[in-house]
């Protein structure tokens, strides 16, 4: 049994880091493998992660961590029974993938304006709380070419757009994702999408 693709890990900068790797053949990850991880810090204790299958030869493990800061560095040991398959390290602050925003809502009761709001996925005491920016994706269910991205570079988790910038009388969907420039993070996953029917009064033409 060998590791074909070494583990790569990303942190949500809150409580979970996710590591993925591939074995050289079909593997029952949860019964055959264990990923041990330990913070390089005085008094820290080793923890064991039981991986799950992620495709035939792929494995994924969700590592539980406390508050993450730049100083944190973890040793990682991948074991198959008594055999050490791979040894490495992981610095969560250098591999951050933010949590996806939630509770995306489209408010259509404002006159001819669409107000999209969502929730910041972090609590106020987390460093990323005040450092997220967002991308909002809006697309038409009827017309695949009607697909647009709005970059939200301010802190407030909301976006206002004129309803008239979208076609009237058809259904649209929206989703939102986040990233943080301060840590040069990857983009989060998209939030679940929300659907609404866009209708507004056309301006009266003489």
């Amino acid at each position: 049994m060998k590791v074909l693709q070494e583990p790569t890990c990303v942190s949500d900068y809150m409580s979970i880091s996710t590591c993925e790797w591939k074995m050289n053949g079909p593997t029952n990850c949860s019964t055959e493998l264990r990923l041990l991880y330990q913070l390089v810090f005085l008094l820290s204790e080793a923890h064991t992660c039981i991986p799950e299958n992620n495709g035939g030869a792929g494995c994924v493990c969700h590592l539980l961590m406390d508050d993450v800061v730049s100083a944190d560095n973890y040793t990682l040991d991948l074991w198959a029974g008594q055999q050490l398959l791979w040894k490495g390290s992981f610095k969560p602050s250098e591999h951050v993938k933010p949590r996806a925003p939630g509770n995306l809502t489209v408010h259509t009761n404002v006159s001819d304006t669409l107000l999209l709001t969502w929730s910041n996925p972090y609590p106020p005491d987390n460093y990323l709380y005040n450092h997220l920016t967002y991308a909002v994706n809006i697309w038409s269910e009827n017309d695949p070419a009607d697909f647009r991205i709005y970059n939200v570079t301010y802190l407030e988790p909301s976006l206002r757009i004129a309803a008239s910038t979208l076609k009237s009388g058809i259904s649209y969907r929206a989703r939102v994702r986040a990233w943080a420039q301060c840590y040069n993070t990857t983009w989060s996953e998209w939030s679940p999408s929300t659907k609404w029917h866009n209708s507004y009064r056309e301006p009266f033409e003489q």
Partner: antibody, heavy 116, light 111 residues
């Protein structure tokens, strides 16, 4: 919110021992390390040691090795710092502080006076 | 005896900017991260800066931290009378057991 409530002021004679308590609330007690530091009157901060409330393991500053003992009671989310063989130079405010690399939250401090 | 050296005192007028230095060595600041603590008169210390330059929630952006080599600096802009306090830098000793260490402390007086 996070709160660290320390026991009240103590007056001790040289050679005696003192045990200061620090009751934690507002977070998962066993998930965060607890440090102890002290500050003599008009002096700076001095780190004394750290305890991992999860397993109870400890690490002490060399200066206090053999004189200090840190323990915890997970049932009451309380950590204790006991300092023995007290001398007048141990007169100080003793602080517990939650954190790992950084000391995020501090107790209000416990004044220990050593006087004959 | 702290191995992190700070000036004993600094002073400036309200509205001005002040900096406080913290000098260490390769086995502490040079190979780790720096924090800063504010201790108002008669109170416990409070974390002001961690990871060299990050502020915990609730700390105004008038406070900023930086690190270069084996030294670190705390800068306070738009000085207010309420900023009058003792300030301590902190890091840990990488040569032994990662034990935390504090600076000697700096008394800030707002004139």
């Amino acid at each position: 919110q996070v709160q660290l409530v320390q026991s009240g002021a103590e007056v001790k004679k040289p050679g005696a021992s003192v045990k200061v308590s620090c009751k934690a609330s507002g977070y998962a007690f066993t998930s965060y390390y607890m440090h102890w530091a002290r500050q003599a009157p008009g002096q700076g901060l001095e780190w004394m040691g750290i305890i991992n409330p999860s397993g109870g393991s400890t690490s002490y500053a060399q200066k206090f090795q053999g004189r200090v003992t840190m323990t915890r009671d997970t049932s009451t989310s309380t950590v204790y710092m006991e300092l023995s063989s007290l001398r007048s130079e141990d007169t100080a405010v003793y602080y517990c502080a939650r954190g790992k690399w950084w000391l995020y939250n501090w107790g209000k401090g416990t004044l220990v006076t050593v006087s004959s | 005896q702290s191995v992190l050296t700070q000036p004993p005192s600094v002073s400036a007028a309200p509205g001005q900017k002040v900096t406080i230095s913290c000098s260490g060595g390769s086995s502490n600041i040079g190979n780790s991260y720096v924090s800063w603590y504010q201790q108002l008169p008669g109170t416990a210390p409070k974390l002001l800066i961690y990871d060299n330059n990050k502020r915990p929630s609730g700390i105004p952006d008038r406070f900023s931290g930086s690190k270069s080599g084996t030294s670190a600096t705390l800068a306070i802009t738009g000085l207010q009378t309420g900023d009058e306090a003792d300030y301590y830098c902190g890091t840990w000793d990488t040569s032994t057991t990662y034990h935390p260490i504090f600076g000697t402390g700096t008394k800030l007086t707002v004139l």
